[in-house]
Interface confidence: low
């Protein structure tokens, strides 16, 4: 018969013949022959393959380090990789979490939208009119402007989204 | 200069209570969030607590979440660290620090030097 040019899925060609490939969790160890199957090993402990695959090598399992504010927050199987996350207080810099930052402050004319998470840095948004936050923070949301008239006082000075409005003594009509 | 003094470590038995403090001098305190941090011997940093400028917010850690309280005493430069039913695994050396203001890419601006808190029978 004609040689394969071409193997069924979970099968690889090689010397002219189809091998099956190793499962996910296991290495190649050698090739299949005319007379021999595939001879597939298990990963070695904190190793993995997460496909059908002809990978003499497992991949290493991430390293969580905790100096980069990591921890696991999913143990790696032969199968998987370790997930990381940050501890308590930090967040992701990017979706592979590969290493972490302090929550960002929300500078000086913005508030805090949304307190950050484990996975989620803060949310900042603009102070709208008639609030303000004149400093940076992670926790502090945009403060109402104090309201003179209920103090029986006037505006001397307008607020801003970071400066809060400055009251004074009503004018006294002379008589 | 910045300055973080921390103090109050010690020995303390498994069930004890310790009060941490933590004096700051060389910026503006109250506008300042500030934050307990801890190294466990051989281990990472592991944040402990939080707090706003005013001490109006506090956050925790879940491993002390209960137990320790998280204070500040703006008049006196100072924050606080109340621990009460302490466990072997909250032997640590402690650290207070200043938050940065621009966090992007540092976790801390100021550290304090660390006060060992040693839990044991």
């Known amino acids: 018969p004609e040689p394969p040019t071409a193997c069924r899925e979970k099968q690889y060609l090689i010397n002219s013949q189809c091998c099956s490939l190793c499962q996910p969790g296991q290495k190649l160890v050698s090739d299949c022959t005319e007379f021999t199957e595939t001879e597939c090993l298990p990963c070695g402990e904190s190793e993995f393959l997460d496909t059908w695959n002809r990978e003499t090598h497992c991949h290493q399992h991430k390293y969580c380090d905790p100096n980069l504010g990591l921890r696991v927050q999913q143990k790696g199987t032969s199968e998987t990789d370790t997930i990381c996350t940050c501890e308590e207080g930090w967040h992701c810099t990017s979706e592979a979490c590969e290493s972490c930052v302090l929550h960002r402050s929300c500078s000086p004319g913005f508030g805090v939208k949304q307190i950050a998470t484990g996975v989620s840095d803060t949310i900042c948004e603009p102070c709208p009119v008639g609030f303000f936050s004149n400093v940076s923070s992670a926790f502090e949301k945009c403060h109402p402007w104090t309201s003179c008239e209920t103090k029986d006082l006037v505006v001397q000075q307008a607020g801003t989204n970071k400066t809060d409005v400055v009251c004074g003594p009503q004018d006294r009509l002379r008589a | 200069e910045v300055q973080l003094l921390e103090s109050g470590g010690g020995l303390v038995q498994p069930g004890g209570s310790l009060r941490l403090s933590c004096a700051a001098s060389?910026?503006?305190?109250?506008?300042?969030?500030m934050y307990w941090v801890r190294q466990a011997p051989g281990k990472g940093l592991e944040w402990v607590s939080s707090i706003d400028r005013t001490g109006g917010h506090t956050y925790y850690a879940d491993s002390v979440k209960g137990r320790f309280t998280i204070s500040r005493d703006n008049s006196k430069n100072t924050l606080y660290l109340q621990m009460n039913s302490l466990r072997a695994e909250d032997t640590a050396v402690y650290y207070c620090?200043?938050?940065?203001?621009?966090?992007?890419?540092?976790?801390?601006?100021?550290w304090g030097q660390g006060t060992l808190v040693t839990v044991s029978s």
């Open positions: 060389g910026f503006t305190f109250k506008t300042s969030p």
């Open positions: 620090a200043k938050q940065a203001l621009l966090t992007d890419a540092k976790r801390f601006d100021y």
